[in-house]
Interface confidence: low
């Protein structure tokens, strides 16, 4: 019957993801029992995305590779609401790589997923970015301005934030 075939499809989809994420946390979307959205355990979810705070300290490139192994990217922040959600899970004495870099050092910032860089939706600390040799962006806490972005050298190991689309089963 219909419910049985739906369940079989779900199970095969879950097996597909199991090699990367042994455990998924799923919630029912809306009122329809057929629509479930999942994030890997222990990732957090906000709107249509899942987030993972990586506490291992790595360079920007290695951090991005680490995210991609998990089927994600370094985080792309699209709205103030999204940033407000993310910072709830961050430690004030740490810095975290974003999926934002300026590879040519010419202040052409680009997101890892090719989302257009929109000056109007950026959250740089005042006076940042301030160094052409600092080509990668972090989010960190400054007591005067709370949470914001700063440009830093890409080789300096930092924690990082990974983001992936929710898994729908």
């Amino acid at each position: 019957n219909f419910m049985y075939s739906k369940t079989v499809k779900r199970l095969s989809k879950l097996r597909e993801y199991q090699q990367y994420h042994p455990s998924l946390t799923c919630v029912m979307e809306g009122k329809d029992i057929e629509d479930w959205s999942c994030c890997p355990t222990p990732w957090t979810s906000f709107q249509s995305s899942c987030y993972f705070i990586s506490t291992g300290m790595q360079s920007w490139t290695k951090s991005q590779k680490n995210c991609s192994v998990m089927g994600a990217d370094l985080v792309v922040i699209n709205t103030r609401e999204e940033q407000d959600f993310i910072i709830q899970n961050l430690k004030r004495n740490s810095s975290y790589f974003l999926g934002l870099s300026d590879p040519g050092g010419r202040r052409h910032w680009q997101w890892v997923d090719q989302t257009p860089y929109n000056e109007n939706v950026t959250f740089w600390h005042s006076g940042e970015p301030n160094n052409l040799d600092e080509r990668c962006a972090i989010i960190n806490f400054r007591s005067s301005e709370e949470w914001g972005w700063n440009d830093i050298h890409c080789h300096v190991p930092q924690k990082s934030i990974c983001k992936m689309k929710k898994i729908y089963i």
């Epitope: 052409l132 040799d133 080509r135 050298h153």
Partner: nanobody, 125 residues
Framework: QVQLQESGGGLVQPGGSLRLSCEVS????????MAWFRQATGKEREFVAA????????VYGDSVKGRFTMTRDHPKKMVYLQMDNLKPEDTAVYYC??????????????????WGQGTQVTVSS
């Protein structure tokens, strides 16, 4: 095609100095982050120094800090490693490396796209 050619290696006594050069043949030299690595016989490749695309920023491996200086000359498309107060443990083949996106100048050899053939440095009395 990016080609890197090291020179300047040789035999030197402990406490002596050497200057290694790396000639880079590419039109995109000014956007390359550059680095020096070394590999002693039977050991893993070790990070020595790196310099950002503009030359404004450098970073050094712990074992060479205060003794080695890395610079670059944009018009000549050259990178240099001035090595002073050399020690026997500095004996190794020294490699020049370049990273095309200029983003990842640091001590991880996996990040570098282009490599020279190496030049031997021997520190011995």
């Amino acid at each position: 095609q990016v080609q890197l050619q090291e020179s300047g290696g040789g035999l030197v006594q402990p406490g002596g100095s050497l200057r290694l050069s790396c000639e880079v043949s590419t039109d995109t030299f000014s956007s390359l982050a550059m680095a020096w690595f070394r590999q002693a016989t039977g050991k893993e490749r070790e990070f020595v120094a790196a310099i950002s695309w503009s030359g404004a920023s450098t970073v050094y491996g712990d074992s060479v800090k205060g003794r080695f200086t890395m610079t670059r000359d944009h018009p000549k498309k050259m990178v240099y490693l001035q090595m002073d107060n050399l020690k026997p443990e500095d004996t190794a083949v020294y490699y020049c490396a370049g990273d095309l996106d200029g983003r990842t100048w640091h001590g991880d050899d996996l990040e570098y796209d282009y490599w020279g053939q190496g030049t031997q440095v021997t520190v011995s009395s």
